[in-house]
């Protein structure tokens, strides 16, 4: 089994307020078994944006189907972006367990929000 890598190819993404933001994340291995979660920010104050195993997350949809056995694309789309959504988003793999434990994080994608065009 190859070592898992989490690839967030975009260092930054800029979106106009009211539009949708696509945050890309792919993984290189199906192992270890466990869910992907997205967070805004790092450390204890980070905010959960999406969890593959729970929800709903009304403004978040997955670009690919994350329940599909062979899926390695965990990119998400966040709708109706507001300035409060600005920040750095991390795609993080957890190892299945009781509870699940953080295994590896992507490098992060910084989302900046432009003023809505008038």
């Amino acid at each position: 089994e190859e070592e898992l890598q989490i690839i967030q190819p975009d260092k930054s993404v800029s979106v106009a307020a009211g539009e949708s933001a696509i945050l890309h994340c792919t993984i290189t291995s199906l192992f270890p078994v466990g869910p992907i979660q997205w967070f805004r920010g790092a450390g204890p104050a980070r905010v959960l944006i999406y969890n593959q195993r729970q929800g709903p997350f009304p403004r978040v949809t997955t670009v690919s189907e994350t329940t599909k056995r062979e899926n390695m694309d965990f990119s998400i789309s966040i709708s109706n972006i507001t300035p409060a959504d600005a920040g750095t988003y991390y795609c993080i793999k957890f190892r299945k367990g009781s509870p699940d434990t953080e295994f590896k994080s992507g490098a992060g994608t910084e989302l900046s929000v432009r003023a809505k065009p008038s």
């Epitope: 199906l30 949809t61 690919s64 189907e65 329940t67 599909k68 056995r69 062979e70 899926n71």
Partner: antibody, heavy 124, light 106 residues
Framework: AVTLDESGGGLQTPGGALSLVCKGS????????MNWVRQAPGKGLEWVAG????????YYGAAVQGRATISRDNGQSTVRLQLNNLRAEDTATYYC?????????????????WGHGTEVIVSS | ALTQPASVSANPGETVEITCSGG?????YGWFQQKSPGSAPLTVI????KRPSDIPSRFSGSKSDSTGTLTITRVQAEDEAVYYC??????????FGAGTTLTVLG
């Protein structure tokens, strides 16, 4: 108890179209991916098509790609398979199946329940 | 397609194993029992080792490397059937094995 009831089979003409419907009960329909599987007379099982729990993602077997459309109505707890340009080799018993809380369309290792089947005969 | 033996046989009370290989890198397998052609299959194992509530504990499933195994302990005459394995290939398409005929001797 989980039940999956298929309907819509019968005698079909080559080149025509069919629409099979599966109604699920006894489980939270909107939480489970669904698949259609068929079995030609004297042959083994063949996967036809599958659909994700929310209906956003659909998957098709090579034999029906471009001729089939799978859809679902979670409010009615139904999944539909439409198959166009029917051929003699589409003659089979078609089974509706439910995934048991894992996987999606095409992930046959997750099937935990089967319908009784509906027979389709394509003949002139 | 998945690869499984065409036939296996066992005496009542014995243990029988049926193997299946060729699934995608997820290496997950389901097992489906069909007692007669045209009758609806019955899931005996899904997601490698999960057993539906109405299936006897004599049926178990496991996987090792890329091979799935269905094990039936204390085989009974009523277990005589064709057993199909199912999975998905690396493209995500559903695949079945050709079926293994279990004959219970005696």
């Amino acid at each position: 108890a989980v039940t999956l009831d298929e309907s819509g089979g019968g005698l079909q003409t080559p080149g025509g179209a069919l629409s099979l419907v599966c109604k699920g009960s006894g489980f939270t329909f909107s939480s489970h991916a669904m698949n259609w599987v068929r079995q030609a007379p004297g042959k083994g099982l063949e996967w036809v098509a599958g659909i994700s729990s929310d209906g956003r993602f659909t998957y098709y077997g090579a034999a029906v790609q471009g001729r089939a459309t799978i859809s679902r109505d979670n409010g009615q707890s139904t999944v539909r398979l439409q198959l166009n340009n029917l051929r003699a080799e589409d003659t089979a018993t078609y089974y509706c199946t439910k995934n048991g809380g894992c996987g999606s369309g095409g992930d046959l290792d997750c099937i935990d329940a089967w319908g009784h089947g509906t027979e389709v005969i394509v003949s002139s | 397609a998945l690869t499984q033996p065409a036939s296996v046989s066992a005496n009542p009370g014995e243990t029988v194993e049926i193997t299946c290989s060729g699934g995608g890198s997820n290496n997950a397998y389901g097992w489906f029992q069909q007692k007669s052609p045209g009758s609806a299959p019955l899931t005996v194992i899904y997601d490698n080792g999960k057993r539906p509530s109405d299936i006897p504990s004599r049926f178990s499933g496991s996987k090792s490397d890329s091979t799935g195994t269905l094990t039936i302990t204390r085989v009974q005459a009523e277990d005589e059937a064709v057993y199909y394995c199912g999975s998905a290939d690396n493209s995500g398409a559903g695949v079945f094995g050709a079926g293994t005929t279990l004959t219970v001797l005696g």
